[in-house]
């Protein structure tokens, strides 16, 4: 797959592949003079024809050198509870982070976990009673395994396998926005924003001070957390005297729409509360903070707008890469579209298609994006994150192209380099019209379904859709049948 072609090597210009093949280096060697440059993926156009044998050689060389590596062989990230115990999870236990250092690398990946939110006493109590790991650090395991973009295996993470990896567990239930401690008046602390700040402060003493790039990434509520906190992290580092650390964001599955629900429902609990209602209530309950420049655009009491990607994005200073399924399951959940394996009604089907259109529209002016036409939720820490493609480009490849756009030789131009795109939004109109989407299974039999089966299963009427698309039903069926799945995930 595309994503496999990003083994890293030092050097400012993409070199012509020399014999013997260059190796992925665990320790990035300091260049002789001045600042070390950011590690730079190879340009493999010259060996494109014989890629498989080239990669096999590289892999076998890499494996034989692996034992000599400065890295520990242990893949786990290790838990560190915050030394500043006043920065806490909901229940007052100290927040923390999991870290796996990569001594030779000046790249740091800080990942914000997702896990929805709660926005009043009742649903926070319920969350504390059934999902305590998302509100307390008391039972966190001592280690975690890095997966997807947090993996240190080049096969699983062709993008940044050599980076320093940090996983920040979500235990504040506030979409990473809060800054209020537990008190006699407040049963729970909501300190998501402060947790990020404190983790960054503590990491400065563990090598982050020498970083070239800090990528603040997150999925779901963590993805929204990236949008809300990326500029504040950059400001913090500047204030603390580290202005040369480039702060960037990667927001996965956190770009929500404040749209009208398919069926209006009362805001009783997290699942069926409309996006705007939940955030309006939440921001008050959490004493939520939003980016300063966004806050200035909305009058007092309207800060909730800044939780929605398409409204906050234009106000951000840091570059942000947006990853978003066009048919995000969490978006559909809060919009009261519950796909339970039963055929959907025509109204639901049109609503789903319209959601894809609206979402595509909001990404039009987002410079760096990856938006496949799939029904799913979250991707970057899934081990199959390398498999999905948009317009023939995988996500790790798109991230690599985005990385390259920050190099000096390309600074002047904001347009992507030829053959290295990073604005990738599917244009086909319904869920799973992209054949590389994660596999969908029949909820009752467990059987894998191809696109045609999935759409039929949802009550999709070929005749009607062919008419909508202005094409022959037979042509549409042919297109769908070619969309068989080759990936085995979920």
């Amino acid at each position: 797959s595309e994503g496999r072609k990003t083994w890293r090597r030092r050097g400012q210009q993409p070199p012509q592949p020399p014999p013997p093949p260059p190796l992925p280096q665990r320790a990035e060697v300091e260049p002789g003079a001045g600042q070390p440059v950011e590690s730079f993926p190879l340009d493999f156009t010259a060996v494109e024809g014989n890629m498989d044998s080239f990669m096999a050689q590289v892999k076998s060389l890499a494996q034989s050198l692996y034992p000599c590596s400065a890295q520990q062989l242990n893949e786990d990230l290790r838990l560190h509870l915050l030394l500043n115990t006043s920065v806490t999870c909901n229940d007052g236990s100290p927040a923390g982070y999991y870290l796996k250092e990569s001594k030779g690398s000046r790249r740091w990946l800080l990942f914000l976990e997702g896990g929805w939110y709660c926005f009043n006493r009742e649903n926070c109590d319920s969350r504390y009673s059934t999902m305590r790991r998302l509100m307390s650090s008391k039972d966190w395991p001592h280690t975690r395994t890095g997966t997807g973009i947090l993996s240190s295996q080049p096969e699983e993470n062709p993008h940044w396998w050599n980076a320093n990896m940090v996983f920040i567990p979500y235990c504040s239930s506030d979409v990473w926005s809060g800054a209020s401690p537990k008190s006699d008046k407040n049963e729970y602390a909501f300190m998501g924003s402060l947790i990020i700040q404190e983790v960054v402060r503590e990491l400065l003493g563990k090598g982050l001070s020498g970083a070239k790039v800090l990528l603040l990434a997150g999925s779901s509520a963590g993805g929204t957390g990236v949008l809300l906190n990326v500029d504040r992290v950059a400001e913090l580092l500047e204030e603390l005297g580290y202005p040369s650390i480039q702060v960037r964001g990667l927001a996965d599955s956190g770009w929500f729409l404040d749209n009208k629900q398919y069926r209006r429902s009362d805001c009783i609990d997290t699942i069926n509360c409309a996006p705007t209602d939940a955030i309006r209530r939440g921001i008050r309950y959490w004493s939520g903070m939003v980016p300063e420049r966004c806050q200035r655009q909305f009058k007092e009491g309207e800060e909730w707008n800044c939780f929605f990607g398409y409204k906050v994005y234009p106000t951000l200073r840091c570059p942000v890469f947006v990853v978003q399924w066009l048919f995000d399951e969490a978006q559909l959940t809060v919009d009261n579209v519950h796909l339970t394996g039963q055929p959907v009604q025509e109204g639901q089907w049109l609503y789903i298609q319209n959601l894809g259109r609206e979402l595509r529209g909001t990404l039009k002016d987002v410079q760096a994006s990856f938006a496949p036409a799939c029904l799913s939720h979250e991707i970057i820490i899934r081990s199959y994150w390398t498999d999905v493609q948009v317009k023939g480009t995988s996500l790790p490849r798109a991230l690599h192209c985005w990385d390259r756009s920050f190099h000096d030789s390309h600074k002047a131009s904001k347009t992507p380099m030829k053959g290295c795109p990073f604005h990738l939004v599917d244009s086909c109109p319904w869920p799973h019209c992209n054949p590389s989407c994660p596999t969908i299974r029949d909820q009752f039999t467990g059987q894998e379904m191809n696109v045609a089966q999935f759409l039929m299963h949802m009550g999709f009427d070929v005749q009607t859709v062919a008419q909508q698309q202005g094409m022959e039903p037979s042509k549409l069926l042919g297109m769908l049948s070619n969309g068989n799945h080759h990936h085995h995930h979920h």
Partner: antibody, heavy 116, light 107 residues
Framework: DVQLVESGGGLVQPGGSRKLSCAAS????????MHWVRQAPEKGLEWVAY????????YYADTVRGRFTISRDTPKNTLFLQMTSLRSEDTAMYYC?????????WGQGTSVTVSS | DIQMTQSPASLYVSVGETVTITCRAS??????LAWYQQKQGKSPQLLVY???NLADGVPSRFSGSGSGTQYSLKINSLKSEDFGSYYC?????????FGSGTKLEIK
């Protein structure tokens, strides 16, 4: 050590009532959600009712809503299930369970038989 | 309400084998899933919570995986004490439905 001990089971006539109790010890009772789960003879587990920590919000399965009432007496560390209008299909072993992440501690169960 | 479809209903296996039990939710439950073991005449015991986290004291031969609607419990090199019934349960909005159970029996 965490302990949950149910009591109050027995034979009840259809249409009759029964109150089950669950005595908790070894943990801070008010800090945990508490559930009732039942299991009919030779059948699987069925979730019945739940009361959250803190505010004590209450939730029921559709099969018992309107007939069963869950409550807790925090000072006495006791959970209750008041069952009314009992039917033969309510015959089961009733377990109380504590929750934080999943139902992490269960009592030994108390058996309720609804029969004439 | 969310339905949990558990399979298989029963499994005949030998000590030392590896087994996988699956649970499918009728909609995304965002990893809010627990697995339990119940031995004949005993109360259930929590094995896994949050889809992948092992409960205290559970041997490492047990592991949970999955996301979205698809979840599984894997038991490596079965021991004689692992035989019994296994249930999944979701915690994504009430009712907190259980799967119908999988009975693990000695071959």
């Amino acid at each position: 050590d965490v302990q949950l001990v149910e009591s109050g089971g027995g034979l009840v006539q259809p249409g009759g009532s029964r109150k089950l109790s669950c005595a908790a010890s070894g943990f801070t009772f008010s800090s945990f959600g508490m559930h009732w789960v039942r299991q009919a003879p030779e059948k699987g587990l069925e979730w019945v009712a739940y009361i959250t920590s803190g505010s004590g919000a209450i939730y029921y399965a559709d099969t018992v809503r309107g007939r069963f009432t869950i409550s807790r007496d925090t000072p006495k560390n006791t959970l209750f299930l008041q069952m009314t209008s009992l039917r033969s299909e309510d015959t089961a072993m009733y377990y109380c369970a504590r929750s934080a992440d999943g139902l992490d501690y269960w009592g030994q169960g108390t058996s309720v038989t609804v029969s004439s | 309400d969310i339905q949990m479809t558990q399979s298989p209903a029963s499994l005949y296996v030998s000590v030392g084998e590896t087994v996988t039990i699956t649970c499918r939710a009728s909609e995304n439950i965002y990893s809010n899933l627990a697995w339990y073991q119940q031995k004949q005449g005993k109360s259930p015991q929590l094995l896994v919570y949050g889809a992948t986290n092992l409960a205290d004291g559970v041997p490492s031969r047990f592991s949970g995986s999955g996301s979205g609607t698809q979840y599984s419990l894997k038991i490596n090199s079965l021991k004689s004490e692992d035989f019994g019934s296994y249930y999944c349960q979701h915690f994504w909005g009430t009712p907190f439905t259980f799967g119908s159970g999988t009975k693990l029996e000695i071959k």
